[in-house]
């Protein structure tokens, strides 16, 4: 029987008695920045090359005894999880280890930086195939460590890191908080977030996805044939590094953005019990557990999108929050969310030649989040069309008037503090799916895109009575690009996308009378690309 | 994930330009910033990563490091350049007294300085 963690990441079609997925990442090199390792362990012998890089601080304490097996335990186990013969994810991947953690598992930001620089120089001297860098470590938030990760990622390297074992917001740690790295939290055999002593896995918007990270069997440095169970977000990150190696081996040309989108797309959705996370973090934490794709040939025909949450704006009246997509992703829609419901909407705006999503806090509000829907849309030409507040009672409207442009998202932003409390709801006229409609006192922003074969449609779900949550999902084959609420519902806290579902949240129904304003309508814009589908068929 | 985000401490030292043979005010009137880990036990004072502006060449990094050493020596401080970065970020790693931070922040090409801190196996 295969260990639970390998079974969990393996799609059903691979599940035989033995974990033997095709092509085990042989075209990929995985760099491990960790403790020293026992490279002659039978699990990893011949698979891991120990570089001469070492940058570690001295061990603490006068009574510390350097015991080789203790010094090697963390790194050896992780190397085994990534590429071990019996218990590894990507059995064909070759690895290189750099020692940046001492025998107590402690290192420095500076040592890690020098290690990352070593990898970049090695890459320049001897370019190989795709590179994955595994960073199974965490320290406090570090601007310089995040910046170094960003530079390495922009040089085409995939960085995977541990979210941290502090049962805390991963955004407070580095490199977990670097947007360019793939940050991994840990779950157990019951798909619960991992508890470690009094602490446990980190969570929050800086986590990209979760992976098995409790009771993971792997190589033990106690002897060359020993195995041991270890736990932590390092083990979870090692699983994702292995999955990334498998994906890159199958499709070596994948960019970081494409890889991240695929990791998210093929993950198991909504299996984690969110009650474990602090209440204010639940909406921000992705409910995703990593898995290998069901086949090794590409899923290039799909329109991939993910949701990116901003940092919290803070409570000041003019506070704003900004959510950004990765460099090779398109921002297809922008929404906002506030727990207090006091917000002034959101807008898409250009910043440094790229669209960003900005949400606006309102007077008396506790702060807002901006939520960007970031998609992979090759050859896309997107723009934002804005209509200022209308004078007419019919409300503000804006549509995509350029030939061949389709509507991918609607945003609205207003200056008045309490929009809609004394106004009747505005309903969007039927049969006009290519336009955004909003309150007459709001400016409306339409995201309009032209891309080969791109088609979109609007889907609505309205509930006449007040409800805390209204959802509408795109059907199979379509991808959610836009998520918003129809105007006129004053008690709406905001809208956001969860996988392929648009969620509109309202204030607690007990505080909202069952008036005409109780009606809540969630509006989803669902798109697909016929061009991507055709291109994929031609490749096959 | 946000690059500008994080519960870290930022000390922005707005500095007067002192008369000092080698000191130049940072260009465009921008002020270099100092960062350190918010988690006190993880701080490693005495070692600093001096990050230079993006397009700074290796020779300029080395020159800036030497300049810092010279100015520190003039004030009676010993410094040690532990590493000069190039390839990913321009800058250098220096072992020095925290008393010299004000001086270092005024060096040409300096974008920000970060105090070294611990990282841990997870």
């Amino acid at each position: 029987s295969i260990p639970w963690n390998l079974e969990r990441i393996t799609p059903p079609r691979y599940r035989a008695d033995e974990y033997q997925p095709p092509d085990g990442g042989s075209l990929v090199e995985v760099y491990l920045l960790d403790t020293s390792i026992q490279s002659d362990h039978r699990e990893i012998e011949g698979r891991v090359m120990v570089t001469d890089f070492e940058n570690v601080p001295e061990e603490d304490g006068t009574r510390f005894h350097r015991q080789a097996s203790k010094c090697d335990s963390h790194g050896t186990h992780l190397a085994g999880v990534v590429s071990g013969r019996d218990a590894g994810v990507a059995k064909g991947a070759s690895m290189r280890s750099l020692r940046v953690l001492n025998c107590q598992g402690k290192g420095t930001v500076s040592g890690t930086l020098i290690g990352l620089e070593f990898i970049r120089k090695s890459q320049l001297v001897q370019p190989v195939g795709p590179l994955v860098v595994l960073l199974p470590l965490a320290g406090g938030y570090s601007r310089v460590l995040n910046a170094a990760c960003q530079r390495l990622a922009r040089a085409g390297v995939v960085l995977v890191t541990a979210a941290g074992n502090f049962r805390d917001d991963a955004c407070l740690y580095s490199p977990a908080s670097a947007p360019e790295v793939i940050t991994v939290g840990a779950t157990n055999a019951q798909d619960q977030p991992v508890t470690l002593g009094t602490l446990g896995t980190n969570f929050g918007r800086c986590v990209d996805l979760f992976a098995p990270g409790e009771d993971i069997i792997g190589a033990s440095s106690d002897c060359s044939t020993c195995f041991v169970s270890q736990s932590g977000t390092s083990q979870a990150a090692a699983h994702v590094a292995g999955i990334a190696a498998m994906m890159l081996s199958a499709e070596p040309e994948l960019t970081l953005a494409e890889l991240r989108q695929r990791l998210i797309h093929f993950s198991a959705k909504d299996v984690i019990n969110e009650a474990w996370f602090p209440e204010d973090q639940r909406v921000l934490t992705p409910n995703l557990v990593a898995a290998l794709p069901p086949s090794t040939h590409g899923a290039g025909w799909q329109l991939f999108c993910r949701t990116v949450w901003s940092a919290h704006s803070g409570p000041t009246r003019m506070a704003t929050a900004v959510a950004r997509c990765a460099p090779d992703e398109e921002l297809l829609s922008c929404s906002s969310f506030s727990r207090s419901g006091k917000r002034r909407g959101e807008r898409m705006e250009a910043q440094g030649g790229k669209l960003v999503c900005r949400a606006h806090n309102a007077f008396g509000g506790e702060g807002v989040y901006a939520i960007a829907r970031c998609c992979l849309l090759p050859q896309a030409n997107c723009s934002v069309h804005t209509a200022p507040p209308a004078e007419a009672s019919m409300g503000t409207r804006v549509h995509c008037h350029q030939q061949g442009h389709v509507l991918t998202g609607c945003s609205s932003h207003w200056e008045v503090e309490d929009l809609g409390t004394h106004k009747p709801p505005v309903l969007r006229p039927r049969g006009q799916p290519n336009q955004c409609v909003g309150h007459r006192e709001a400016s409306i922003h339409a995201s309009c895109c032209h891309a080969p074969g791109l088609e979109c449609k609007v889907k609505e779900h309205g509930i006449p009575a007040p409800q805390e949550q209204v959802t509408v999902a795109c059907e199979e084959g379509w991808t959610l690009t836009g998520c918003s609420a129809l105007p006129g519902t004053s008690h709406v806290l905001g809208a956001y996308a969860v996988d392929n579902t648009c969620v509109v949240r309202s204030r607690d129904v007990s505080t909202t009378g069952s008036t005409s304003e109780g009606a809540v309508t969630a509006v989803a814009i669902c798109c697909r690309s016929r061009h991507l589908a055709q291109a994929s068929q031609e490749l096959q | 994930q946000e690059d500008e985000d994080g519960d870290y401490e930022e000390l922005v030292l707005a500095l007067r330009s002192e008369e000092d043979g080698l000191a130049e005010a940072p260009e465009h009137g921008t002020t270099a910033t100092f960062h350190r880990c918010a988690k006190d036990p993880w701080r490693l004072p005495g070692t600093y990563v001096v990050v230079l502006k993006e397009e700074t060449h290796l020779s300029q990094s080395e020159r800036t490091a030497r300049r810092l050493q010279a100015q520190a020596a003039r004030r009676g401080y010993l410094t040690k350049i532990l590493h000069v970065f190039h390839g990913l970020l321009p800058g250098f790693l220096v072992k020095m007294s925290g008393d010299l931070l004000e001086l270092a922040l005024k060096l040409p090409h300096v974008d920000y300085i970060e105090e070294d801190s611990s990282v841990f196996a997870q």
Epitope: S1, P3, D60, S69, K70, S73, H74, D86, A87, Q104, G105, K106, N165, L196, G197, L199, E214, D215, I216, I217, S220, D222, C223, T225, C226, F227, V228, S229, Q230, S231, G232, S234 | S118, F120, A121, Q122
Partner: antibody, heavy 130, light 107 residues
Framework: EVQLVESGGGLVQPGGSLRLSCAAS????????MSWVRQAPGKGLEWVAN????????YYVDSVKGRFTISRDIAKNSLYLQMNSLRAEDTAVYYC???????????????????????WGQGTTVTVSS | DIQMTQSPSTLSASVGDRVTITCRAS??????LAWYQQKPGKAPKLLIY???SLESGVPSRFSGSGSGTEFTLTISSLQPDDFATYYC?????????FGQGTKLEIK
């Protein structure tokens, strides 16, 4: 699924010796500490001894110290209990059990998190009588 | 050595009842306590670890609580299959000790 099968029990005279074996399946055997637990007729459970994955650490209940030796052979996926100087009070059903636990790091310290004995053998009976 | 004392030694109850078994440690063991169920002629089965974590595959009617020296095992609604002997076990150190057991029988 991991299975544990004990053998080696039997009737022995006081002062005699016996060697119990426990055969396991799968790589998970060598990944965990292992224990021997005994149960005298009509009585409760008594932990006897345990051993680390690589055999480098061993612990015993006071009443068997110096008489019993726990060992394991990773290559054979086997656990052993060598019992010398047996006494009447050692009469019991002897179970081998897997001590499921995991190691993790927390801010520079290596910790052990123990779940309990999650897999047990069916037991082997040892009778010490003249 | 740490002593573990279970109470009661025997407990009579009916199907559907809510029952509680207590385990007391002679010194603090934090949350390092497990509960086992044993039926006649069978090996014990792990139910709860770390005082309150439910082992995989164990019905949710079983729950554990406590820390320090006082611990309880609760069965929210007794099922016919639950009549057995229950043991607590401490593992504050690498040397373990069991409680003397609580026999749960049909009233």
């Amino acid at each position: 699924e991991v299975q544990l099968v004990e053998s080696g029990g039997g009737l022995v005279q006081p002062g005699g010796s016996l060697r119990l074996s426990c055969a396991a399946s799968g790589i998970t055997f060598s990944s965990y500490w292992m224990s021997w637990v005994r149960q005298a007729p009509g009585k409760g459970l008594e932990w006897v001894a345990n051993i680390k994955q690589d055999g480098s650490e061993k612990y015993y209940v006071d009443s068997v110290k110096g008489r019993f030796t726990i060992s394991r052979d990773i290559a054979k996926n086997s656990l052993y209990l060598q019992m010398n100087s047996l006494r009447a009070e050692d009469t019991a059903v002897y179970y081998c059990a897997r001590d499921r636990g995991t190691y993790y790091y927390a801010s520079g310290s290596y910790n052990y998190y123990y779940y309990g004995m999650d897999v047990w053998g069916q037991g082997t009976t040892v009778t010490v009588s003249s | 050595d740490i002593q573990m004392t279970q109470s009661p030694s025997t407990l009579s109850a009916s199907v559907g009842d809510r029952v509680t078994i207590t385990c007391r440690a002679s010194q603090s063991i934090s949350s390092w306590l497990a509960w086992y169920q044993q039926k006649p002629g069978k090996a014990p089965k792990l139910l709860i670890y770390k005082a309150s974590s439910l082992e995989s595959g164990v019905p949710s009617r079983f729950s554990g609580s406590g820390s320090g020296t006082e611990f309880t095992l609760t069965i929210s609604s007794l099922q016919p299959d639950d009549f057995a002997t229950y043991y607590c076990q401490q593992y504050n150190s690498y040397s373990y000790t069991f409680g003397q057991g609580t026999k749960l029988e049909i009233k």
